[in-house]
């Protein structure tokens, strides 16, 4: 069975084809090759002789037991080598020779028992080494790591490391890898020698499900003293053994670390006193809790020095009390409990993401809701009912505003966005908005992107509501049940590049409303009911137009519409997916491609 | 279509069939078997995925006695610092995991419950597997 040609001459997918040897009929130009799940078993020298251009090679689950010297010799362009799930028993010293450009080596679940004997010391370009899910017992980083000066990610998770000693990290003292991210999760740790991490700098350290008791966690965290880490991730996994007890003493040792960003990811434990618990983390710049349950919500009004707070997938009794002077970014998403938003006091806040919480807002939106006048980014998408009762007083700095899939009330009663002169991006898609007021978008003089799909218009008619949006480049009006539009609806949109009118109820096509769109490149009219043209003579679309989508419409392939069908053929160079432009009527032509029709109409007496 | 039996409990019988062409082997055990009146137990899964599990989600299509419920999307793996350790599993890596579950106080009426589970993962998104579970429910008491 042949391999699947994904990108001709470049990418070949040969997964699970029961190959016992490397295929010899693929072009020399192949760059990406997936040979996973084939019983190759043995890689001799120059196994990839015929693939001089190879950049990505996936050998996952190929039952490889032996890799000989020079197996990958000649793959000087290879950047990614994946060996996941191979039961390697014999790995020659020169197994990886010739890989002078390798950046990513994945040797997950390959029976690797030690880093010491892993022959990768010459791979100077290596950025990512993933040796998770192996049998490694010692965390001693071999001397050859001093050659791996580009290493950024080392994944040692799910191994058998129990102890970390001062000598294990000696090589990092010799050549501080300023950018190294280290994942030690799911190793059964019980001892970290104090001083082992002294004066070590890491970009990221992840320790999840490493400790089987509170005491072990406490002493191991104390053993991290002296570490300088940009981002520290602690926590557990839902499907692994969890700590029975967790209290403030667990994290006391963090006072002896220098941490820029902290994240606690999943804890099967109720956090009550977060002020005491995170006492050592009051001055980290970014603080993040993922999938934890928080009892006392008032604690977030303590004087923490955080600049970024992230609360994701957490459980709260009620919406937390947030009073944080220095906070610039708040991400509060996919949380449960506390369905009603209550005011927060965050005077420095610039970025606020409150999406996917099922929250309802009694009144939105003004500076008093968020306690700031500095807000530039506000995401309230995928929430409940949001009642628009204020026109963003004090929030004039806003540049990005997203309400999609929330239920907006009172949108068509006044110019809600009147004061948002700096707004660049607005998404009100699927917000149950019924446009019945022409001034709905007044004030949005800087707006570049407007997404309003899935809403509706009075009498299914698009009026002149865009008159002030002179900088608009992207407009999505899909799924709005539109049947007609004002001939001057788009007259002021001279910068518009993309217009999506798909999934509406237009029965005819007219070029007139687009005559002023001098920058229009993409016009999508797919999934309407277009049968013919509105006027007998259709003009040309703007000369800037490059893509016109008329697929999945109800074209009437009859003589009376011959001029329209001819016009469509004349637009051939603009049309996309022409094979999906089919006749709907008459029945004998149903399903026929419009462009292949040859309608010769004669006047039959 | 070959049917794979999972388990029987006092009020339910659970089995599944594959609803995709690939039919990559997956082993599913429930201990103790689910009782629809109330249940607490462990779900054990052994599986070798054909793509990374990063950003795994399930599309659930549930049918109750021939009545179709709306499609439900259950996100399991968001893509970073996920709740489940198997979210970091790579294509070809053994997934051997136990997940605890519990629910109570749901009253199910007697009949045949079907649940098509479409597992989607990776970037670009592709189907990982598709299983159609059939639960025959015979409550002892209403």
């Amino acid at each position: 069975e042949p391999c699947v040609e994904v990108v001709p001459n470049i990418t070949y997918q040969c997964m699970e084809l029961n190959f016992y040897k490397i295929p010899d009929n693929l072009p020399f130009s192949t760059k990406n090759l997936d040979l996973s799940f084939n019983p190759l078993r043995h890689l001799g020298s120059y196994s990839f002789f015929s693939f001089p251009e190879l950049q990505v090679l996936d050998l996952s689950r190929c039952e490889i037991q032996t890799i000989e010297d020079g197996a990958y010799q000649s793959l000087s362009h290879l950047s990614t080598l994946i060996l996941t799930g191979n039961p390697i028993q014999s790995l020659a010293l020169g197994a990886f020779s010739g890989l002078s450009s390798l950046q990513k080596l994945v040797a997950v679940e390959t029976n690797l028992a030690s880093l010491e004997n892993f022959p990768i010391g010459h791979l100077k370009t290596l950025k990512e080494l993933n040796v998770a899910h192996n049998l490694i017992q010692s965390f001693k980083l071999p001397e050859y790591f001093s050659n791996l000066t580009n290493l950024e990610h080392l994944d040692l998770s799910s191994n058998k490391i129990q102890s970390i000693y001062c000598t294990d990290l000696r090589v990092l003292h010799q050549m501080p890898l300023l950018n190294l991210s280290l994942d030690l999760s799911l190793n059964p740790m019980n001892f970290i020698q104090p001083g082992a991490f002294k004066e070590i700098r890491l970009h990221k350290l992840t320790l999840r499900n490493n400790f089987d008791s509170l005491n072990v966690m406490k002493t191991c965290i104390q053993g991290l003293a002296g570490l300088e880490v940009h981002r520290l991730v602690l926590g557990e996994f839902r499907n692994e053994g969890n700590l029975e007890k967790f209290d403030k003493s667990a994290l006391e040792g963090l006072c002896n670390l220098t941490i820029e960003e902290f994240r606690l990811a999943y804890l099967d434990y109720y956090l009550d006193d977060i002020i005491d618990l995170f006492n050592c983390l009051t001055n980290v710049s970014s603080f993040s809790l993922v999938s934890v349950t928080i009892e006392r919500v008032k604690d977030f009004s303590y004087n923490f020095g955080w600049q970024h707070l992230e609360l994701v997938n957490c459980k709260f009794g009620q919406f937390p009390t947030l009073k944080l002077k220095s906070l610039k970014r708040l991400t509060f998403t996919s949380n449960k409990g506390g369905n009603a938003f209550s005011e927060v006091d965050l005077p420095s806040l610039e970025f606020l993401d409150l999406s996917r919480n099922g929250l309802s807002f009694k009144g939105c939106c003004s500076q008093s809701d968020f306690g700031t006048t500095s807000l530039k980014y506000l995401d309230l998408s995928f929430n409940g009912v949001i009642t628009m009762s204020s026109n963003f007083l004090g929030l004039e700095q806003l540049e990005h505003l997203d309400f999609q899939h929330s239920n907006l009330k009172q949108m068509s009663e006044f110019s809600v966005f009147l004061s948002l002169r700096n707004l660049i991006y607005l998404d009100i898609s699927h917000t149950h908005t019924r446009v019945a007021f022409n001034g709905i978008f007044n004030g949005l003089s800087s707006l570049e992107v407007l997404k309003m799909a899935g809403n509706s218009f009075q009498e299914n008619f698009l009026p002149d509501i865009f008159t002030e949006l002179r900088n608009l480049t992207f407009l999505d009006l899909s799924q709005c049940q539109l049947e007609q539009l004002s001939p001057t609806a788009f007259n002021s949109l001279s910068s518009l590049q993309v217009l999506n009118m798909s999934h509406n109820n237009f029965f005819s096509l007219d070029t007139f409303p687009y005559k002023c769109l001098n920058s229009l490149q993409v016009l999508d009219y797919s999934l309407n009911h277009i049968m013919t043209s509105k006027k007998q003579e259709l003009q040309h679309f703007p000369s800037s137009l490059a893509f016109l989508n008329l697929t999945q419409n109800d074209f009437a392939c009859t003589c009376e519409h011959q001029s329209f069908l001819q016009w469509i053929k004349d637009q051939r160079q603009l049309l996309v997916e022409v094979e999906r432009m089919e006749c709907a009527t008459p029945s004998d032509k149903q399903g026929m491609p419009v462009l292949s029709l040859n309608i010769t109409c004669q006047m039959n007496k | 279509q070959k049917q794979y039996w999972v388990c029987n409990s006092s009020d339910a019988s659970i089995s599944y069939t594959y609803c995709d062409k690939m039919q990559y082997p997956i082993s599913i055990n429930v201990n103790p078997c689910i009782e629809l009146k109330r249940s607490k137990g462990l779900l054990h899964i052994f599986y070798i995925p054909r793509r990374d599990l990063k950003q795994l989600y399930f599309n659930l299509y549930i049918t109750v006695n021939t009545m179709n419920l709306p499609k439900r999307k259950e996100v399991i793996c968001r893509g970073s610092d996920d709740d489940y350790s198997f979210c970091r599993a790579l294509k070809g890596e053994t997934v051997n995991t136990t997940i605890s579950f519990s629910f109570k106080g749901i009253k199910f009426s007697k009949g045949k419950y079907k649940c098509v589970v479409e597992a989607i993962s990776g970037s670009p998104e592709e189907m990982l597997f598709c299983l159609e579970f059939v639960i025959l429910h015979q409550p002892n008491s209403n």
Partner: nanobody, 117 residues
């Protein structure tokens, strides 16, 4: 078993030309691809050019594109490498290699090419 014998190497001035030959014998029916590699002192062996016996498709390393030409004469079981506009950095031992369907790679003994004024 496949035997490969190279010839045609030597000393040449920058800008000059050489033509290398590689004669194959033995189980030549099993050969899929043939090619030329080179190894400069202290460096790893690298691809120069490849040719597929079945359909004649060809590959050249970027460093020799437009200067070197690989060709084959099936009747003589020989592969050639025509090297024009030679540069000092082309100095190396040039090896002929053949890849069979077994899969196995056979090598010639190598021929020295020196580009120097």
């Amino acid at each position: 078993e496949v035997q490969l014998v190279e010839s045609g190497g030597g000393l040449v001035q920058p800008g000059g030309s050489l033509r290398l030959s590689c004669a194959a014998s033995g189980s030549i029916f099993s050969i899929n691809d043939m090619g030329w590699f080179r190894q400069a002192p202290g460096k790893e062996r690298e691809h120069v050019a490849l040719i597929r016996i079945k359909d004649g498709s060809i590959y050249y390393a970027d460093s020799v594109k437009g200067r070197f030409t690989i060709s084959r004469d099936n009747a003589k079981n020989t592969v050639y490498l025509q090297m024009n506009s030679l540069k000092p950095e082309d100095t190396a031992v040039y090896y002929c290699a053949a890849k069979t369907g077994t899969p196995f790679v056979y090598w010639g003994q190598g021929t020295q090419v020196t580009v120097s004024s």
